[in-house]
Interface confidence: medium
C-alpha cells in the first residue's frame, strides 16, 4: 500500500511542478519524490520499508499516473540510499536519495528543484506547497492527477505540546498545520515547497490526517545537506 | 508476528537425500527474496543459496560448495520455502537457517534452524 | 570468491569499554549499482544470527546506537562504543555485493 500520509487540496495545474516525482512499486505509487539533480530524486527512507524485493522505479514529467501524457517518462533506480540513520522504528532521518538508471531528460514538465542550504527554521505562519498522489479523503481515494495544498508552516514549540506531537519534533524536522487540508498516505517522500525552495520531504510515520492536533511533519532538507551533497558528489 | 519456522532435517548418510522445509508467516511472503545460510558444528556462518521473488522471475543464486547438488524453490501460495539437498556429503553437516531478505539486501529475519547430520 | 577476513578472532573486553572489530574484503565490495553491501551480524550463544549494521553504517532497527559501521572499499570497521553484558557472543561481517556472498570467520566479544 501507499506509504505516508492530500486531503482538503485541490488539482494541481499539470506539469507546474516538474520536480514532482511518484515513486512506484511494481508499476503502482508509492510514495512522492523530488527531483532534486538530473540523476537524483530525493524521497523518504520509509517508502522502500516493505519493498522487499520489488522494483523501485521513479515516474518523472506526470501529471496523471495512468494517462499517456509526452513528457512522462519512467526510470528505473540504480541505487537506493537510505539515511545512515534512517530506522523503521522512528520519524528521524526518514530521508531517501534515488540514484536513476540514467540522467533525466529535462524539459518544461521535468526539472530539478532548487534545496534550502541554509540550516535556518522557516517562519511560522509562511505558507508552503505541499503536493502528491496521496488520497484525498478518510476512506482512502487515490487521486489519479497530482494534487496539492497550501499549508501554513507551525511553530515548533507548538508542534511539541503534549496534546499534539508530544517533543517529538526535533530541530530537524519541521511542522505544518494540519486543520482539514494536509498531506496523507501516499504523500510521505514528496516535497514542502516554500518561495520557490524545496524546505522540507513529508516524513512516512502513519499519523492520523486532517486533524488540527497531529500536525504534518516534515524533514528539513537544510538539515541534511552536508550528507546529501556527500551523496550527489 | 514475523516468523520463519523450519523443519525437515536429521541423520542421512554420504550421498544421500534431504528436502528441507521452511513456513513463512506475519509479512507478505511472495514480496521477499529468500535465503537459506548454515553453520557447521562449532564454525562461522555460510551464504548457502538466495531466491528472488515472482517479479524478479524467481532467479536463483548458490554457494559453489553446493552448486549442482542443492537446489531452491518456494511456494508462494503456501508461503513455504524448500531446500532440496542431493548427494550430501560429510561437510553438508550443519544447522540451516531459513532467512529473509530486506530490500537494502540484509538478512533480517532468521529461522532458529534445522539441523543436518550426514555420517555413514 | 570475495574472502572477507575478521580480525581480532577473540576480543576480550571489559564491561563499558569501546571495542572495535575489523573486517578486510580481499577485492573492492562496492556493487556495481554503487551501493557497498556490507553488514555485520551478532550471534549470542544458542540462539539464531541478528542483523545489526546494514550498508556499511545503517544501524538496523531497535540497535542501540552504541553500534556504528563505518569503511568502504575492501576495510571495514564496526565500533561499540560501551559495551554492554548483553553485546557478548560472536560478530561476523558479510559482503552481499558480489556472489557468492560470504561471511567472515567471526570475531568472539568476551569478558576479559
Known amino acids: 500500500p501507499p506509504r505516508g500520509r492530500i486531503l482538503g487540496g485541490r488539482e494541481a495545474e499539470a506539469h507546474a511542478r516538474p520536480y514532482m516525482a511518484s515513486v512506484q512499486l511494481n508499476g503502482a505509487h508509492l510514495c512522492g519524490g523530488v527531483l532534486v539533480a538530473e540523476q537524483w530524486v530525493l524521497s523518504a527512507a520509509h517508502c522502500l520499508e516493505d519493498a522487499a524485493d520489488g522494483k523501485v522505479q521513479v515516474l518523472l514529467g506526470a501529471h496523471s499516473l495512468s494517462q499517456p501524457e509526452p513528457s512522462k517518462r519512467l526510470y528505473d533506480v540504480l541505487r537506493a540510499v537510505p539515511h545512515p540513520d534512517s530506522q523503521p522504528d522512528t520519524i528521524d532521518h526518514d530521508l531517501l536519495l534515488l540514484q536513476l538508471s540514467e540522467k533525466a531528460t529535462l524539459g518544461p514538465a521535468v526539472r530539478p528543484l532548487p534545496w534550502q542550504r541554509v540550516d535556518r527554521d522557516v517562519a511560522p505562519g509562511t505558507l508552503c506547497d505541499v503536493a502528491g498522489w496521496g488520497i484525498v479523503n478518510h476512506a482512502g481515494r487515490r487521486p489519479d492527477s497530482l494534487q496539492h495544498v497550501l499549508l501554513p508552516v507551525l511553530d515548533r514549540a507548538t508542534c511539541n505540546r503534549r496534546t499534539h506531537h508530544d517533543g517529538a519534533i526535533t530541530e530537524r524536522l519541521m511542522c505544518a498545520e494540519s486543520n482539514r487540508r494536509d498531506s496523507c498516505k501516499g504523500d510521505s517522500g514528496g516535497p514542502l515547497v516554500c518561495g520557490g525552495v524545496l524546505e522540507g520531504v513529508v516524513t512516512s510515520g502513519s499519523r492520523v490526517c486532517g486533524n488540527r492536533k497531529k500536525p504534518g511533519i516534515y524533514t528539513r532538507v537544510a538539515s541534511y545537506a552536508a550528507w546529501i551533497d556527500s551523496v550527489l558528489a | 508476528e514475523v516468523q520463519l519456522v523450519e523443519s525437515g532435517g536429521g541423520l542421512v548418510q554420504p550421498k544421500g537425500s534431504l528436502k528441507l522445509s521452511c513456513a513463512a508467516s506475519?509479512?507478505?511472503?511472495?514480496?521477499?527474496?529468500m535465503n537459506w545460510v548454515r553453520q557447521a558444528p562449532g564454525k562461522g556462518l555460510e551464504w548457502v543459496a538466495r531466491i528472488r521473488s515472482k517479479s524478479n522471475n524467481y532467479a536463483t543464486h548458490y554457494a559453489d560448495s553446493v552448486k549442482d547438488r542443492f537446489t531452491i524453490s518456494r511456494d508462494d501460495s503456501e508461503s513455504m520455502l524448500y531446500l532440496q539437498m542431493n548427494n550430501l556429503k560429510t561437510e553438508d553437516t550443519a544447522m540451516y537457517y531459513c532467512v529473509r531478505q530486506g530490500y537494502y539486501w540484509y538478512f533480517d529475519v532468521w529461522g532458529t534452524g534445522t539441523t543436518v547430520t550426514v555420517s555413514s | 570468491d570475495v574472502l572477507m577476513t575478521q580480525t581480532p578472532l577473540s576480543l576480550p573486553v571489559s564491561l563499558g569499554d569501546q571495542a572495535s572489530i575489523s573486517c578486510r574484503s580481499s577485492q573492492s565490495i562496492v556493487h556495481s549499482n554503487g551501493n557497498t553491501y556490507l553488514e555485520w551480524y551478532l550471534q549470542k550463544p544458542g540462539q539464531s544470527p541478528k542483523l545489526l549494521i546494514y550498508?556499511?553504517?545503517n544501524r538496523f532497527s531497535g540497535v542501540p546506537d552504541r553500534f556504528s559501521g563505518s569503511g568502504s572499499g575492501t576495510d571495514f570497521t564496526l565500533k561499540i562504543s560501551r559495551v554492554e553484558a548483553e553485546d557478548l557472543g560472536v560478530y561476523y561481517c558479510f559482503q552481499g555485493s558480489h556472489v557468492p556472498w560470504t561471511f567472515g570467520g567471526g570475531t568472539k566479544l568476551e569478558i576479559k
Open positions: 550498508t556499511v553504517s
Open positions: 506475519g509479512f507478505s511472503f511472495n514480496t521477499y527474496a
